[in-house]
């Protein structure tokens, strides 16, 4: 017998063909021999089965000897062996209906787990293979679990259910609620204005929640809240700002913070957390601030950086248009009795300049 796989909620067409291409009598019955539909004269008649209100046939194809049965809004319990009786012959079609659904909301926070559950008819032994938008393949039986969602898991997941060498494909749209970046570092000279931006990696029509930027300054013994805010239908309103520094926040998305000036005492790491309506848990983005200061005091020219820098970064003091350079993989460099001229302090990573500050050394007479 023929096997047909169907998807819960979809429509399936079970075909039945007569050898003669003409309108003739036919009946569709289920395995309990209960009539579902058939032809009487020129009219479609329906039997007492549970399918009667969802079953139909293409009348336009009857005179071509095609007596298919269409079942709309498929249910798992529609799985059965259906018998088509035409021209004194019986054709059996086994219909297996499957459903694949996410156990929870399909809008999930980064780091949360996604579980896909397969609904299948009794006696079936299907296998499921899912492919994420990023190309990750996951296999399973009745359930498929993705323990920790990543932002690249956002998009359409394609899942293939296989049974008796037949397949049916499901598409599930998953939205991973996360910031576009897990972490970002801002490099600034002392006194410059600092802009922090926290773009989201998703769009929702209605976005309501609240958040906080929690900051650990390198020079401080403990961390503290820099700003708290609410988000109502994508409009940002500040709740509380620390007195020092006096941060400013944009009123619209993306979340945007301005620090009037970069100072060594502000250098450090922050964590912006955002709680969203109807979600358990919070979105996080780490942000780092590195501040550079170049100073001349008496016969000493010093360049310092504060904040989270990796040990492989190089700090250099260099006299413009001259070869004089001092470099260190450290957070401070200095030159004693520097030559007069324009000196550059450079923070670089494998030759790429991340931060630069110029200081003019005047000749001492």
């Amino acid at each position: 017998k023929k096997v047909v796989l169907g998807k819960k909620g979809d429509t399936v067409e079970l075909t039945c063909n007569a050898s003669q291409k003409k309108n003739t009598q036919f009946h569709w019955k289920n395995s309990n021999q209960i009539k579902i539909l058939g032809i009487q004269g020129l009219f479609l008649t329906k039997g007492p089965s549970k399918l009667s209100d969802r079953a139909d046939s293409r009348k336009s194809l009857w005179d071509q000897g095609c007596f298919s049965m269409i079942i709309k809004n498929l249910k798992i319990e529609d799985s059965d062996t259906y018998i088509c009786e035409v021209e004194n012959k019986k054709e059996e079609v086994e219909l297996l209906v499957f459903g694949l659904t996410a156990n929870s909301d399909t809008h999930l926070l980064e780091g949360q787990s996604l579980t896909l559950t397969l609904e299948s008819p009794p006696g079936s032994s299907p296998s499921v293979k899912c492919r994420s938008p990023g190309g990750k393949n996951i296999q399973g039986g009745r359930t498929i679990s993705v323990p920790q969602l990543e932002r690249q898991d956002s998009g359409t997941w394609t899942c293939t259910v296989s049974q008796d060498q037949k397949t049916v494909e499901f598409k599930i749209d998953i939205v991973v609620l996360a910031f576009q970046k897990a972490s970002s570092t801002v490099y600034k000279k002392e006194g410059e204005q600092v802009e922090f931006s926290f773009p989201l990696a998703f769009t929702l029509e209605k976005l309501t929640g609240s958040g906080e930027l929690w900051w650990q300054a390198e020079r401080a013994s403990s961390s503290k809240s820099w700003i708290t805010f609410d988000l109502k239908n994508k409009e940002v309103s500040v709740k509380r700002v620390t007195q020092d520094p006096k941060l400013q926040m944009g009123k619209k998305l993306p979340l945007h913070l301005t620090l009037p000036q970069a100072l060594p005492q502000y250098a450090g790491s922050g964590n912006l957390t955002l709680a969203l309506e109807a979600k358990t848990g919070k979105l996080h983005q780490e942000v780092n601030l590195v501040v550079m200061r170049a100073t001349q005091f008496q016969e000493n020219l010093t360049c310092e950086v504060w904040g989270p820098t990796s040990p492989k970064l190089t700090l250099s003091l260099k006299l413009e248009n001259k070869g004089a350079t001092v470099s260190k993989q450290a957070k401070a460099v200095w030159v004693l009795n520097p030559e007069a001229g324009m000196w550059q302090c450079l923070l670089s990573d494998s030759g790429q300049v991340l931060l630069e500050s110029n200081i003019k050394v005047v000749p001492t007479w």
Epitope: W214, S225, A275, T280
Partner: antibody
Framework: EVQLVESGGGLVQPGGSLRLSCVAS????????MSWVRQAPGKGLEWVAN????????YYVDSVKGRFTICRDNAKNSLYLQMNSLRAEDTAVYYC????????????WGQGTLVTVSS | DIQMTQSPSSVSASVGDRVTINCRAS??????LAWYQQKPGKAPNLLIF???SLQSGVPSRFSGSGFGTDFSLTITTLQPEDFATYHC?????????FGQGTKVEIK
């Protein structure tokens, strides 16, 4: 180690005054909002008042407005609650707490000082 | 003022039980909710902030959830040291307000 130590509680007659003090240590006091919270015997917690880092903003629960004044002296790492026109219903253990937790939570509390208003 | 209503007012449970305490705000408070534990004669101790984040040093058997008006605190496997009174508190708008407290007692 963060520490908050309250003092100044005691027995006072209705209509009388009392000044509670809270001395903070182990953190930069001038960087945090501070609160007073009270708890009447056998009852729940009731937030009384709080003040901004520099003392410029102050908020009170309605039942104490006009009678209680919260203030701070950052040079002395101290928080105060001046309580005037005391009533029997002000009888409670008064706690000083730091609003230093994430999401505006009260992360450190003192041991409390008992204020009894009775004739 | 925002009223905070805790339920139940007391709960009798045994060591190993799962206990859930609810807290309802009279108006939406987003995630501006904290949970505190208080033992007799002691000051309250912060457990949960921002409705669902665990304070550093607090055992992972404690968890919080909710947003807007309905919140809950769950202790998955009750330990002997968890018998105490639990308070919820909103920090959405002044005056800050607390629930009336829920006493977790030994059955």
């Amino acid at each position: 180690e963060v520490q908050l130590v309250e003092s100044g509680g005691g027995l006072v007659q209705p209509g009388g005054s009392l000044r509670l003090s809270c001395v903070a240590s182990g953190f930069t006091f001038s960087s945090y909002w501070m609160s007073w919270v009270r708890q009447a015997p056998g009852k729940g917690l009731e937030w009384v008042a709080n003040t901004k880092e520099d003392g410029s903003d102050k908020y009170y629960v309605d039942s104490v407005k006009g009678r209680f004044t919260i203030c701070r002296d950052n040079a002395k790492n101290s928080l105060y609650l001046q309580m005037n026109s005391l009533r029997a219903e002000d009888t409670a253990v008064y706690y000083c707490a730091r609003e230093g937790g994430q999401w505006l939570a009260l992360d450190y509390w003192g041991q409390g000082t008992l204020v009894t208003v009775s004739s | 003022d925002i009223q905070m209503t805790q339920s139940p007012s007391s709960v009798s449970a045994s060591v190993g039980d799962r206990v859930t305490i609810n807290c309802r705000a009279s108006q939406g408070i987003s995630s501006w909710l904290a949970w505190y534990q208080q033992k007799p004669g002691k000051a309250p101790n912060l457990l949960i902030f921002g409705a669902s984040s665990l304070q550093s040093g607090v055992p992972s058997r404690f968890s919080g959830s909710g947003f807007g008006t309905d919140f809950s605190l769950t202790i998955t496997t009750l330990q002997p040291e968890d018998f105490a009174t639990y308070h919820c508190q909103q920090a959405n708008s002044f005056p800050w307000t607390f629930g009336q407290g829920t006493k977790v007692e030994i059955k």
